[in-house]
């Protein structure tokens, strides 16, 4: 799985979404886990209704909420009021027994302001060997990225790269 | 081990800059954050910033913004504070310290030794 | 920003003593706070996070507590390794802000 960056600013609300195949996943309940570490195992934050027909019910655990889009395939968590300790890997998992299958990894970031993130005169263009040509750029408050690369300086787009 | 192994004391001129280094081991760098903190002589410490070396997100103390940039080079494992414009007020020690898992949740585990910045004409 | 008023600024003990050192917060931290030491060559240790969680191989003599918007670290019976610099650390909303410390110096 490649990670996803999700940006957002201390003290207002981000929104996560984990797109899925809603044939493949029809009747599994979905979560939203954290990983506090390289090992061990993800941690429970909060998971959609224990009925999946009532899955498109907010359902919150503090600050976070979830809710599916079972027919669309799209999994949203809310981060309200976000804080620095929010920071972090996350994963958007699909339910089906014991098992858990990873939809999404998410790295989420907080920022303390929005301009933080890079300097306007700091661009970074693509080399030789790197190629943005299908990076395909939806407005949003948070940036998707694949592992190991270096983001574009805006904090206002998410970039999806398939 | 991990370690932290912060660049040497310099001795730089009013006006001038200076760029620091802290460098990682023991550890996968890009895992986890790094925060930058300064202790003026006999005083107290001030968090300057943090950065995410897996993305080169940054956060900064407003006080320190303009005067402080944080960059990583995610090949040597090694994260930089420049400071620009030096005055007096700058002469302190710089510590790096590593965040936690991708965060700062638990603080700020390990620290770097610290480099001494002396501003003089 | 979270103001960290740390006291006392300065305790004078003798080795075995029992000490306690109090952080006030200026706004809620839910915990998010840590304990520093600093020895005189600069070298700094994190003793505590979470309010109260031990860090490992930090003797079992020092502990952190939390009462309300107070946070406090005490070392039951100080021992002469114990004798330096310790600060508050706040770490639940930027900028992240530290005590002013308190210089540990023995009697």
């Known amino acids: 799985h490649n990670t996803t960056v999700f940006q957002g600013v201390a003290g207002q609300s981000l929104q996560v979404s984990c797109p899925y195949d809603s044939m493949k996943h029809w009747g599994r309940r979905k979560a939203w886990c954290r990983q506090l570490g390289e090992k061990g195992p993800c941690q429970r934050v909060v998971s959609t209704h224990n009925l999946w027909l009532l899955s498109f019910l907010r359902r919150w655990n503090g600050s976070t909420a979830i809710t599916d889009d079972t027919l669309g395939g799209t999994l949203t968590i809310t981060l309200r009021n976000l804080q620095p300790h929010d920071a972090g890997l996350y994963q958007c998992q699909s339910l089906h027994g014991s098992e858990a299958d990873t939809l999404r990894k998410v790295l989420v970031e907080v920022l303390a302001d929005p301009l933080d993130h890079r300097d306007a005169g700091d661009l970074w263009f693509p080399g030789e060997s790197e190629s943005f040509e299908d990076a395909h750029v939806e407005h949003s408050i948070s940036r998707s990225l694949l592992e190991g690369e270096i983001p574009f300086p805006p904090t206002s787009h998410h970039h999806h790269h398939h | 081990e991990l370690q932290l192994q912060e660049s040497g004391p310099v001795l730089v001129k009013p006006g001038a800059s200076v760029k620091m280094s802290c460098k990682a081991s023991g550890y996968t760098f890009t895992d986890y954050y790094m925060n930058w903190v300064k202790q003026s002589h006999g005083k107290s410490l001030e968090w300057i910033g943090v950065i995410n070396p897996y993305t080169g997100a940054t956060s900064y103390n407003q006080k320190f913004k303009g005067k402080a940039t944080l960059t990583v080079d995610k090949s040597s494992s090694t994260a930089y504070m420049e400071l620009n414009s030096l005055t007096s007020e700058d002469s302190a020690v710089y510590y790096c310290a590593r965040g936690t898992y991708y965060s700062n949740y638990e603080g700020f585990p390990y620290w770097g030794q610290g480099t001494l910045v002396t501003v003089s004409a | 920003d979270i103001q960290m008023t740390q006291s006392p600024s300065s305790l004078s003990a003798s080795l075995g003593e029992r000490v306690s050192l109090t952080c006030r917060a200026s706004?809620?931290?839910?915990?998010?706070l840590s304990w520093l030491q600093q020895k005189p060559d600069g070298t700094i240790k994190r003793l505590i996070y979470a309010a109260s969680t031990l860090d490992s191989g930090v003797p079992k003599r020092f502990s952190g507590s939390r009462s309300g918007s107070d946070y406090s670290l005490t070392i039951s019976s100080l021992e002469s390794e114990d004798f330096a610099d310790y600060y508050c650390l706040q770490y639940a909303s930027y900028p992240y802000t530290f005590g002013g410390g308190t210089k540990l110096e023995i009697k």
């Open positions: 706004q809620e931290i839910s915990g998010y």
